[in-house]
């Protein structure tokens, strides 16, 4: 079963910036990837970026960097100021559209115990869905 | 044939707001985000924004938010970008352009631009 | 924001020289899901509207003349006119098609001897 993992960071230099970090284990083909926060894509989210494997990367404020690491993960960098800073508990989402699985999407925030510059290992998180 | 026409060139004082507007044809015009692009002497070319025609959705520079609003009409075909607050830094030709089939942000297709002069 | 630097600002041909114009980009513009260099050129003939040549680093768009060479790969690409003809005077811009925001440098002009 193809599963999605999430790993978020807050950077020790500066606060309001963070690190997200998504995979897809799975054997399908990647499709688009899709990063949200606030909840899943579609469902109460507001979308951050969209990585297409062969179109390119469209991000959003306050996305500032959104880059492939390889085939079957992507990384985000966020930055903030004001009402557009992320917090905290702010939840990030990553949904994988994958042939011949479909879509997979998994949603992570930041370890509550981390102190900046820590983050949990980059473990799968609980599937929210399946499409 | 791909076509973008763009509306005629603008004199606007300062503190004014001015509205470009940059009519499609040859294409479906919803099929393609329409890209805005600014060129001035000093700064070459600028990207200051997009818009997905199909339902609207913007994604700016964030230099040019506050300063540029985009629309479509899409009975018509059309996209219009209006700038506001307008000073003589703003003075520049702007563009529209089609984003291509293939990549993200590579324009294929350009409006002839609308020259925006802010002269008092 | 990706910064594009291109080089030389202006170069003066004759007919039938090659041409060679530099962009650099300060970060990579090479996925890492599919090897594809997000980097575009752009031409813009006096008075006229800018025009794409070449985009994915070294794909010609349609119509485009072959005299028209992209090449290079992560932070350095180059733009060869083969043979320079006197209507290839113009501006020529590199673009990054990466991601949002697409930035532009600040362009070579050719001139025809």
């Known amino acids: 079963t193809p599963e999605v993992w999430v790993q978020v960071r807050m950077e020790a230099t500066e606060l309001s910036s963070f690190t997200i970090r998504c995979g897809f284990l799975g054997s399908g083909s990647i499709s688009l990837v899709t990063v949200s926060w606030g909840g899943p894509n579609g469902a109460g989210g507001t979308t951050l970026a969209v990585l297409h494997p062969e179109r390119g990367i469209r991000q959003w404020a306050p996305a500032r960097q959104a880059r492939w690491e390889t085939q079957s993960s992507i990384s985000l960098i966020l930055e903030g100021s004001g009402a557009s800073s992320p917090c905290a508990n702010t939840t990030f989402c990553c949904k994988f559209a994958s042939f011949p699985e479909g879509s997979w999407e998994a949603c992570g925030s930041l370890p509550p115990s981390s102190d900046p510059g820590l983050s949990a290992p980059p473990t799968p998180a609980p599937i929210l869905r399946a499409d | 044939e791909v076509q973008l026409q763009q509306s005629g060139p603008e004199l606007v004082k300062p503190g004014a707001s001015v509205k470009i507007s940059c009519k499609a044809s040859?294409?479906?015009?919803?099929?393609?985000?329409m890209n805005w692009v600014r060129q001035s002497h000093e700064k070459s070319l600028e990207w200051i924004g997009e818009i997905n025609p199909n339902n609207g959705d913007t994604n700016f520079n964030q230099k040019f938010k506050g300063k540029a609003t985009l629309t479509v009409d899409k009975s018509s075909s059309t996209a219009f970008m209006d700038l506001r607050s307008l000073t003589s830094k703003d003075s520049a030709v702007y563009y529209c352009?089609?984003?291509?089939?293939?990549?993200?942000?590579?324009?294929?297709?350009w409006g002839q631009g609308t020259s925006v002069t802010v002269s008092s | 924001d990706i910064v594009m630097t291109q080089s030389p600002s202006s170069l003066a041909m004759s007919v039938g020289q090659k041409v060679t114009m530099s962009c650099k980009s300060s970060?990579?513009?090479?996925?890492?899901?599919?090897?594809?260099?997000?980097l575009a050129w752009y031409q813009q003939k006096p008075g006229q509207s800018p025009k794409l040549l070449v985009y994915f680093a070294s794909t010609r768009e349609s119509g485009v003349p072959d005299r028209f060479i992209g090449s290079g790969s992560g932070t350095d690409f180059t733009l060869t006119i083969s043979s320079v003809q006197a209507e290839d005077l113009a501006d020529y811009f590199c673009?990054?098609?990466?991601?949002?925001?697409?930035?532009f440098g600040g362009g070579t002009k050719v001139e025809i001897k």
């Open positions: 673009q990054q098609h990466y991601s949002t925001p697409p930035t």
């Open positions: 970060q990579s513009l090479l996925s890492n899901n599919n090897q594809k260099n997000f």
């Open positions: 040859g294409y479906t015009f919803t099929d393609y985000y």
């Open positions: 352009a089609r984003e291509g089939g293939s990549s993200y942000y590579a324009m294929d297709y």
